[in-house]
């Protein structure tokens, strides 16, 4: 091993801040990868790693591309994957990851699944089905053309599966209410049996959600199939078409046939022999966990190792299991001593924000966030033009129809609790993703489902309902939701994206950049209404004034939460208004504030906590 000029941290309670995220993985997976990467070093040295939410962290983690604000620009795909600086102040100790890479768990793109029997677990690539290996979603075994994947390595053994994002399941944006494509459909007198970019100048693939676009003018955008979008070849950016014909043989997944280098490829039309259109299939990507563990080694003071089996060797190779070699362990223990973690005391200075107050403090719970959604950031820019926004018809009809053979069919299209996890009883939910008062009812969101709580006698609780059935295009996991009391528009936030619904018509996703929020704002914890079309927008201990009409924050207005709301947890993960009170949720608890619903006073009169309680027992009235 080698160390870096003898540099090391002078304390053993290391703090880190995840400043921004890659779109390649869900945010909770990124959080987990970084936490596991730190834990690798904490296992063998007396170090603890605490996540904080500001630039005062020892190790600031950032995704960037090309020139990204330091003297060491990234280089596009492959080559340099990431870099880190040795321990010290400022940029020293920070770790930067090249977002031109495909970040994965080391085994290919991470594809969320829908329906099936795996509760939305991501696809496992490669997987075995009927003795064959698949490295992308497939339509094999089905007669309805809906792509699916196994969520374990062996479908034949485990039988666990889900459906991949597909226009046969749903569409995004547009005015088709999220319904699946109807194939074939008529557009400008011509019949289309697949998504098309015809009539658009922006390259977005769309389809009609009825059999005749010319007549009905109903359409949606087709989800991007990241597992099947090719690179290189002569069709970069196009989708694999399965099945395709090559040298007279039919292929239902990517193949290396015809190549000496073993690289997987596919045709982008149904017949390679006639059309000669092809590209390389997405690669396995780089394990964010492994690369992060290597970079964090640097950030702790380790230089490269000359031992090829060591994590600190300067070449990436994917491996499973505990990644440290004896050389890595010797190096970190040389710097920080033997043994594992010290007493798990919090670091002396984590952040400047106040800590949560009673009830008993809990570890900060980070609201889980959504899989990245794809599609235009604003409404459609050309033909097909949007249809009328009034009287929306019911949401999508749900799961694809069953095929005659394996894999098994998806669940019923009715709102059902069969595939809901955790249990269908909201009283069993520890922490909800988001809570909001919408149309007079308190809505509790969790993992793509929601319950409605109507505050009256009888059966006050309804649900669960599929979120995407009511609000098509929303991701499975939300950070917060808010209904504008004046216009009744509903705002949803997930990660750095926002969707705004007027009835069933959606605008979005829009990036938080468009709201005037910088990259350090990684999610929105909630909004509270003010008068005159204004609201307060919250994110991790800070609050901005937000104009609901222009959908912009006033950047000069940002203050610390405790300046306006004394005694609430600074890191509340969900904030909402209910019956004219403001609620700040942290873990299982809420802090209720008698909220002065008016424009900020000059002296920032502080709103006082008047109650602290349990979300389930006190709000949901669970037994």
């Amino acid at each position: 091993f080698q160390t870096f000029k003898g540099l090391k941290w002078d304390h053993h309670n290391i703090t880190y801040w995840i400043q921004n995220y890659s779109e390649d993985l869900p945010r909770d997976m990124i959080d987990d990868a970084f936490a596991r990467a730190f834990a690798v070093w904490g296992e063998v040295a007396p170090l603890t790693f605490t996540r904080v939410y500001g630039p005062e962290a020892d190790i600031v983690i950032q995704f960037g591309v090309a020139e990204h604000g330091d003297g060491y620009p990234f280089d596009g795909k492959d080559g340099l994957l990431a870099h880190a600086f040795p321990p010290g102040a400022g940029v020293q100790g920070d770790a930067h990851f090249d977002d031109d890479e495909l970040w994965s768990l080391g085994k290919g793109v991470v594809i969320p699944t829908y329906y099936g029997n795996s509760n939305g677990a991501p696809c496992h690539f490669p997987f075995t089905f009927e003795g064959r290996s698949y490295s992308a979603c497939t339509t094999d075994g089905r007669n309805d053309g809906t792509p699916w994947c196994s969520t374990t390595a062996d479908y034949d053994k485990d039988g666990k599966f889900g459906f991949c994002p597909s226009e046969r399941l749903y569409t995004e944006h547009g005015n088709g209410e999220g319904k699946p494509c109807v194939f074939p459909f008529i557009f400008e007198g011509r019949s289309y049996s697949a998504c098309t970019t015809k009539g658009r100048s922006d390259g977005y693939r769309w389809c009609a959600t009825t059999a005749n676009y010319d007549q009905d003018k109903l359409y949606g955008f087709c989800p991007t199939r990241v597992d099947a979008t090719v690179v290189g070849g002569n069709s970069a950016g196009e989708l694999c078409v399965f099945p395709f014909v090559f040298l007279g043989k039919q292929y239902s997944s990517c193949t290396s046939d015809g190549r000496r280098d073993g690289r997987l490829w596919c045709a982008t039309t149904s017949n390679f022999d006639t059309d000669k259109k092809w590209g390389f299939c997405p690669d396995q990507g780089y394990s964010l966990f492994l690369v992060a563990a290597h970079e964090f080694g640097h950030a702790l003071g380790l230089d490269h190792s000359s031992v090829p089996e060591a994590l600190m060797y300067p070449l990436y190779s994917y491996l499973e299991g505990f990644p440290l070699n004896k050389d890595d362990i010797d190096g970190i223990q040389y710097l920080y001593g033997r043994g594992s973690k010290p007493d798990p005391r919090p670091p002396a200075t984590t952040t400047t924000e106040p800590q949560p107050t009673a009830p008993p403090t809990m570890c900060p719970t980070i609201p889980p966030t959504a899989y990245p959604t794809v599609g235009p950031t604003v409404g459609p820019t050309g033909a097909p033009s949007p249809g009328p926004t009034s009287s929306p018809s019911p949401g999508p009809t749900g799961a694809p129809s069953p095929g005659p053979t394996a894999p098994p069919t998806a669940g019923s299209s009715e709102a059902s609790t069969e595939s809901l996890s955790p249990a269908d009883n909201p009283c069993n939910v520890d922490v909800f993703d988001a809570i909001a008062e919408i149309q007079g009812a308190l809505h509790f969101f969790k993992d793509g489902w929601y319950w409605k709580f109507l505050n009256h006698r009888g059966s006050p609780l309804q649900g669960p309902f599929l979120t995407a059935r009511t609000w098509p295009a929303l991701p499975a996991t939300l950070d917060s939701a808010f209904e504008d009391p004046q216009t009744k528009r509903v705002f949803f936030f997930s990660g750095r994206q926002m969707w705004v619904y007027t009835g069933k018509t959606v605008l979005g996703p829009r990036s938080l950049d468009k709201l005037g929020l910088g990259p350090e704002v990684t999610h929105v914890s909630g909004l509270l209404p003010r008068r005159l079309g204004k609201a307060l927008l919250f994110s991790k201990g800070r609050v901005w004034r937000f104009d609901l009409k222009s959908q912009k924050v006033d950047p000069q207005s940002v203050i610390r939460v405790d300046k306006e709301f004394s005694g609430v947890p600074w890191n509340s993960h969900d904030i909402f208004q209910y019956q004219d009170k403001a609620y700040f949720c942290h873990g299982k608890f809420f802090w209720r504030v008698s909220f002065q619903n008016e424009v900020n006073k000059v002296d920032h009169e502080v709103n006082q906590v008047d109650d602290v309680g349990y979300v389930t027992y006190d709000l949901l009235q669970c037994p």
Epitope: F4, K5, L7, E67, G69, D70, G71, Y72, P73, F74, D75, G76, D78, G79, L80, L81, A82, H83, A84, F85, P86, G88, G90, V91, Q92, H294, E295, H298, D303, H304, P314
Partner: antibody
Framework: EVQLLESGGGLVQPGGSLRLSCAAS???????DMWWVRQAPGKGLEWVS?????????FYADSVKGRFTISRDNSKNTLYLQMNSLRAEDTAVYYC?????????????????WGQGTLVTVSS | DIQMTQSPATLSLSPGERATLSCRAS??????LAWYQQKPGQAPRLLIY???YRATGIPARFSGSGSGTDFTLTISSLEPEDYAVYYC?????????FGQGTRLEIK
């Protein structure tokens, strides 16, 4: 002992081309980022181009972008600079330099070894 | 691009004296600064990296200090072989840039 040895300089007419080489020895060449830095007669130092250790990524000063191409052959421990459309203002001693940093550990700053330089004169 | 300004342009001192060379960056570059010595007809030679670390084989009379925007190279007691041109170079932001140089000459 680390050594960098440039070659390929000479007199060339404006609009002409030259290919400079830098033979490296005494260190694991493939691990390090490599640079070309030039110095016009009587003037200061100016960076020209860098190629990262992996060989793919390259960066260029605005003054040479589109005309010069840096490359490396890790199997031959050699760095190259292909110079096309040469101009009078490209006249300089061209040095190849080894970055003290390598790969993804970017705390180091400085070029710890330099070649002796090769003179490129662009004149009609 | 970050501008690196060295002062003075020329410094005339006698052997045994203390030399102080200054380098100022137009914006903060943390400690990403290197100093080089160049003698006529020779390639530059790395003296100091990361503002304050002496490169291999560099005598202890050479020292570097500073961070942010202001940096200093100090030669505690000048030796005859120290008369040369000295350049600073930053890598706190892209692209890297060099100062225009300070000529250290015998008084």
């Amino acid at each position: 002992e680390v050594q960098l040895l440039e070659s390929g300089g000479g007199l060339v007419q404006p609009g002409g081309s030259l290919r400079l080489s830098c033979a490296a020895s005494g260190f694991t060449f493939s691990w390090y980022d490599m640079w070309w830095v030039r110095q016009a007669p009587g003037k200061g130092l100016e960076w020209v181009s860098v190629i990262y250790s992996s060989g793919g990524p390259t960066f260029y000063a605005d003054s040479v972008k589109g005309r010069f191409t840096i490359s490396r052959d890790n199997s031959k421990n050699t760095l190259y600079l292909q110079m096309n459309s040469l101009r009078a203002e490209d006249t300089a001693v061209y040095y190849c330099a080894k970055d003290r940093a390598y790969g993804d550990y970017v705390g180091w700053n400085g070029f710890d070894y330099w070649g002796q330089g090769t003179l490129v004169t662009v004149s009609s | 691009d970050i501008q690196m300004t060295q002062s003075p342009a020329t410094l005339s001192l006698s052997p045994g004296e203390r030399a102080t060379l200054s380098c100022r960056a137009s914006q903060s570059i943390s400690s990403f600064l290197a100093w080089y010595q160049q003698k006529p007809g020779q390639a530059p030679r790395l003296l100091i990296y990361d503002a304050s670390y002496r490169a291999t084989g560099i005598p202890a009379r050479f020292s570097g200090s500073g961070s942010g925007t202001d940096f200093t190279l100090t030669i505690s007691s000048l030796e005859p072989e120290d008369y040369a041109v000295y350049y600073c170079q930053q890598r706190g932001n892209w692209p890297i840039t060099f100062g225009q140089g300070t000529r250290l000459e015998i008084k």
